[in-house]
């Protein structure tokens, strides 16, 4: 009877070790799986469009990272109280987990589009560079559903990469004409977005608090109307001291207006950036290492 | 040299509406960062914003006479026009064109930096 | 009634100084910078400092703009008898009251 119940235990630690086997081998295959699914897709800058199937709904990137899903590309989401699925670019570099939601890298986008567009989102979404504006309304549906961070990637035409980075960034409602609202800074590009870089000019730089507006729809401090003159949907004030959906410059620029794609705290205002990546994870992220 | 001159009738029946028209020589209307504007002064009184309006058709109006005021552009006649309805005595003014231009960036700021020479419209029967 | 008030008058003699206010309130000057107009008799007005301070190209340095609170002022110094005319302060007042103007102040000089 003992040699009985012994070789139970035997036959079940086995067991055991062979389901932990199993799932490192699911798990392979799944990665394996994708990995040559997207070198399938990936050839050049052809799509990268990444189907899970309905295996699960994901409420950002972080938790397709999470779930296993290693490689960079467009997967659907559904944050908390979106009505409906969408496509995001989730980058899974960078630490991983990534949510983008906006790209500039070409100018092959046009920014200067009205309240609607802003809102529900347009742009390329299916190429890996391509560019897009997520939608205001899914902005919020995101970072309302956890506190994230927010990481804008800069480039310039020089080949010098800079980055700035926020917690605790939240888009408002509707009502609220999707109200930006950012938390601490830190990165090498410098405080554009809360206009810290000098205490006199935040009252008209920072972009802190400050309502979304477009062409028709004008919602900043200034007496004429920024987006139309900046031909951009932005957070303006009056009008800004960063515009990342400005108009697609190969860097020094002369303009009427500082319409171009504008980090001032790096390039100052008559420089348009070549790329540019803003993306959110959550503050508390924590890469789920297999 | 930019230049702006007004155009329309001097004489205007009350509870008619006011017609002017302003031509710009010397630069395209449709140049961005520019809102070309309408302004009047009563006879020996001081100035009076009416409103402005982009080269795209976005338009602005002062708020006391949103009602009665509409203001166009024909870009491809380089022009812009004022329309008042409803006019009274009260409305007896010289009326000026004006271009209002952004003047800085840090923080942006506007103002009327062309005028045109004026045209005195009298409301009267 | 204009929301921006000015002196309607002014003087001064050849060589002197003069100041001319313009007084407003939190949510036109005090939030907002200030532009001044000239108008010589019988002309259209002309921009004579914008931003608060700046003058624009061809404009004298014997014109200088300042503000404090909801209060700006223009200060001709040097007076000179081609600068008898009347001056306008005008400012943005938000989008409930749009552009305004002061009611003018007459200079005249002595």
């Known amino acids: 009877l003992e040699d009985c119940a012994q070789e139970q235990m035997r036959l079940r630690a086995q067991v055991r070790l062979l389901e932990t086997r199993v799932k490192q081998q699911q798990v392979k295959i799944k990665q394996l799986l994708q990995e040559n699914e997207v070198q399938f897709l990936d050839k050049g800058d052809e799509n990268t469009v990444i189907d899970l199937g309905s295996k699960r709904q994901y409420a950002d990137c972080s938790e397709i990272f999470n779930d296993g899903y290693k490689l960079s590309g467009f997967y659907k989401i559904k944050p908390l109280q979106s009505p409906a699925e969408f496509s995001v670019y989730c980058d899974m570099s960078d630490g991983g987990g990534w949510t983008v939601i906006q790209r500039r890298s070409d100018g092959s986008e046009n920014f200067n589009r009205g309240w609607k567009d802003y809102e529900n989102g347009f742009g390329n979404f299916v190429q890996k560079h391509g560019e897009y504006w997520l939608g205001n309304k899914n902005l919020h549906f995101l970072t309302t559903q956890e506190d994230y961070t927010l990481k804008i990637d800069l480039a310039d035409f020089e080949k010098n990469s800079r980055y700035a980075q926020y917690k605790n960034f939240k888009v408002g409602d509707e009502k609220n004409f999707y109200e930006l609202n950012i938390g601490e800074y830190s990165g090498t590009a410098g405080d554009s977005l809360a206009g810290n870089f000098h205490p006199e000019v935040q009252w008209w730089a920072s972009h802190q608090r400050m309502k979304f507006s477009t062409w028709d729809r004008d919602h900043d401090n200034y007496e004429g109307n920024c987006a139309e003159e900046d031909q951009s949907g932005w957070w303006f004030n009056r009008c800004h001291s960063a515009n990342l959906n400005g108009v697609y410059y190969s860097g020094p620029y002369t303009a009427k207006t500082d319409n171009g794609i504008v980090w001032y705290t790096w390039h100052g205002w008559w420089y348009s950036l070549k790329s540019v990546v803003m993306k959110i994870r959550p503050n508390d992220f924590i890469p789920n290492v297999i | 040299q930019v230049q702006l001159q007004e155009s329309g009738p001097g004489l205007v029946k009350p509870s008619q509406t006011l017609s002017l028209t302003c031509t710009v020589s010397?630069?395209?209307?449709?140049?961005?960062?520019?809102?070309w504007s309408w302004i009047r002064q009563h006879p020996g009184k001081g100035l009076e914003w009416i409103g402005y309006?982009?080269?795209?058709?976005?338009?602005y109006y002062n708020p006391s006479l949103k009602s009665r005021v509409t203001i166009s552009v024909d870009t491809s006649k380089n022009q812009f026009s004022l329309k008042l309805s409803s006019v009274t005595a009260a409305d007896t003014a010289v009326y000026y064109c004006?271009?209002?231009?952004?003047?800085?960036?840090?923080?942006?700021?506007?103002?009327?930096?062309?005028w045109g020479q004026g045209t005195m419209v009298t409301v009267s029967s | 009634q204009s929301a921006l008030t000015q002196p309607p008058s002014a003087s001064g003699t050849p060589g002197q100084r003069v100041t001319i206010s313009c007084s407003g309130s939190?949510?036109?000057?005090?939030?907002?910078?200030v532009n001044w107009y000239q108008q010589l008799p019988g002309t259209a007005p002309k921009l004579l400092i914008y931003?608060?301070?700046q003058r624009p190209s061809g404009v004298p340095d014997r014109f200088s703009g300042s503000k404090s609170g909801t209060s700006a002022s223009l200060a001709i110094s040097g007076l000179q008898s081609e600068d008898e005319a009347d001056y306008y302060c005008?400012?943005?007042?938000?989008?409930?009251?749009?552009?305004?103007f002061g009611g003018g102040t007459k200079l005249t000089v002595l």
């Open positions: 004006a271009r209002d231009s952004v003047m800085g960036y840090a923080p942006r700021v506007r103002a009327f930096d062309i």
């Open positions: 010397g630069g395209s209307i449709s140049s961005g960062g520019y809102y």
């Open positions: 309006i982009y080269y795209s058709g976005s338009t």
């Open positions: 939190s949510s036109n000057i005090g939030t907002n910078t």
């Open positions: 931003s608060t301070n």
């Open positions: 005008s400012s943005w007042a938000g989008d409930l009251n749009g552009r305004l």
